[in-house]
């Protein structure tokens, strides 16, 4: 913490400005008022104070808003958002796209991602769900941060705004977050033809259920491996030899290259060794022929 | 424009490990695997492994097993490769190379990173 | 694993020339799964063909791929001055992956 000190009357500050940064870091604390520095916040940005300095003006608005920063303050920050932590970020209340483009911005190319993410929820809280304005900010100035919202933020998405999101948006989510987002997905573009919805469908399959992949494959998708392998685990495995291959279509190849990989090589696993001999492409490690496969889970839920 | 750029140029000493960087730009990141081969001074390719960037998933070449590791960082379009208890027959030229999903062509490459390791 | 072979190991050919490098593998290798690449001194590999005989984006005509089984052909039909280089055969139709040793076509 800084040394409290009396201000030098000669140092005295009555507005922000490039003279500060030639006050060390007593000085500021001493001679700098945290009311005048927050309603003059807007100036912050264009002086080329130290990141010690900064930690000084952090400090003041700290001790003058002990519950959070207003959204007047926080929207100014430039530079300064820099210096807070999560714990910072989560006592904000934020509504404004300004507020946070602006963070957005500043953030870039720095290792913020905790403190973006946390930003982002704390946007999504104030403005009571995740609606198209939002989406279009993060996918326009943030590719990727949709996926650090939680899957119960991430419900708060209307099926109606699933359209604004782009596939590079959902690089980043992992299968719980798909989970929430596929079955809006689906809602949202289920008035459109087989092949046209296969193209909007295709980045949030990670979350479809083997009943939705099974009719894709009914619908000669061609869907390729890199769609393939991102499907979950449980709804690839039930999947026939021949509905995968209808599945795929010419990129059935593809798996021969895969096989060493999850959920080719569990679903290889599960299948008849006849059944993948079909396919001509040298998979091996199936079911041997004349072996009978006991489902003991079954059995156990019977006993 | 499509580009994996590498981390530079590494000298190690026997028994230490090193860790390459490959950042990808200009592509859909999940939808390539990451694959790593090396190329000894003078001497031709030889795969060493690769990492589904969707799952995290990896395959190893067996003549590297439990001395490579391989890892990414989807947020930062980052794969890394992690090489091990480091002998003088690592002293290479490690590149990371695209491959689409469900092929097995690499068609974009790395710059290379040169790793030496001598005492 | 898949051993591949490759012959010559140097190609000594004079601009203009045909160019006929060999990738012979120790098992049957499925065709979809053969590819090429061309390495220059201090530059990294760059994939010329893939699938045994499709030409990789960028990749002038004058180089074409062919082969079945084991065996398998990369021709380039006139050698111009920037194809002297290594050019290495390399098969995913078996783990792990291999390359073959190269072969190097030099100016005679």
């Known amino acids: 913490d800084v040394e409290r000190t009396t201000c030098p009357p000669e140092k005295e500050v009555h507005e922000i400005d490039e003279s500060l940064i030639f006050y060390k870091k007593r000085e500021l604390e001493a001679c700098v008022d945290a009311a005048l520095l927050a309603a003059q916040m807007d100036r912050v940005d264009a002086i080329p104070f130290t990141y010690e300095q900064l930690d000084v003006l952090k400090h003041k608005l700290d001790e003058l808003y002990p519950q959070g920063y207003p959204e007047s303050v926080i929207r100014h920050l430039g530079h300064l958002f820099l210096k807070m932590s999560p714990e910072d970020i989560r006592k904000w209340n934020v509504t404004s796209l300004e507020t946070l483009k602006a963070l957005l911005k500043v953030s870039k190319g720095h290792e913020m991602s905790a403190q973006v993410a946390t930003l982002i929820d704390r946007v999504v809280v104030g403005r009571g769900q995740l609606d198209k304005d939002t989406v279009d900010t993060l996918t326009a100035f943030c590719p990727g941060c949709l996926c650090s919202l939680s899957p119960e933020r991430l419900s708060s998405v209307p099926p109606s705004v699933i359209g604004a999101v782009r596939p590079q948006d959902l690089d980043t989510c992992g299968p719980r977050q798909l989970d929430v987002l596929y079955p809006k997905a689906r809602l949202a573009f289920q008035n459109m033809s087989g092949s046209e919805y296969f193209v909007k469908i295709r980045p949030f399959l990670g979350g479809a259920p083997t009943e939705d992949v099974k009719a894709l494959s009914q619908q000669n998708v061609s869907m390729d491996l890199a769609t393939f392998m991102k499907l979950r685990r449980e709804a690839v495995l039930p999947l026939t030899v021949a509905e995968v291959q209808k599945l795929l279509g010419p990129h059935v190849e593809g798996l021969k290259v895969e096989e060493q990989h999850s959920p080719v090589r569990d679903w290889i696993l599960k299948q008849r060794q006849d059944d993948l001999d079909t396919l001509g492409l040298g998979l091996q490690g199936g079911i041997p022929n004349g072996y009978l496969i006991l489902d003991l889970s079954v059995r156990e839920a019977l006993s | 424009e499509v580009q994996l750029v590498q981390s530079g140029a590494e000298v190690k000493k026997p028994g230490a490990s090193v860790k390459v960087s490959c950042k990808a730009s200009g592509y859909t990141f999940t939808d390539y695997n990451m694959d790593w081969v090396r190329q000894a001074p003078g001497q031709g390719l030889e795969w060493m492994g690769d990492?589904?960037?969707?799952?995290?998933?990896?395959i190893y070449n067996q003549k590297f097993n439990g001395r490579v590791t391989m890892t990414e960082d989807k947020s930062a379009s980052t794969v890394y490769m992690e090489l091990s208890s480091l002998r003088s027959e690592d002293t290479a030229v490690y590149y990371c190379?695209?491959?689409?999903?469900?092929?097995?062509?690499?068609?974009?490459w790395g710059q290379g990173t040169t790793v030496t390791v001598s005492s | 694993e898949i051993v591949l072979t490759q012959s010559p190991a140097t190609l000594s050919l004079s601009p203009g020339e045909r160019a006929t490098l060999s990738c012979s593998a120790s098992?049957?290798?499925?065709?979809?799964?053969l590819s090429w690449y061309q390495q220059k001194p201090g530059q990294s590999p760059r994939l010329l063909i893939y699938?045994?005989?499709n030409l990789a984006s960028g990749i002038p005509a004058r180089f074409s791929g062919s082969g079945s089984g084991t065996d398998y052909t990369l021709t380039i039909s006139s050698l111009e001055p920037e194809d002297f280089a290594v050019y290495y055969c390399h098969q995913w139709s078996s783990f792990p992956y291999t390359f073959g040793g190269g072969t190097k076509v030099e100016i005679k």
């Open positions: 098992s049957s290798v499925i065709s979809s799964y």
């Open positions: 190379a695209r491959r689409r999903i469900g092929t097995g062509y690499f068609d974009v």
């Open positions: 699938r045994t005989s």
């Open positions: 990492i589904n960037p969707s799952t995290g998933g990896t």
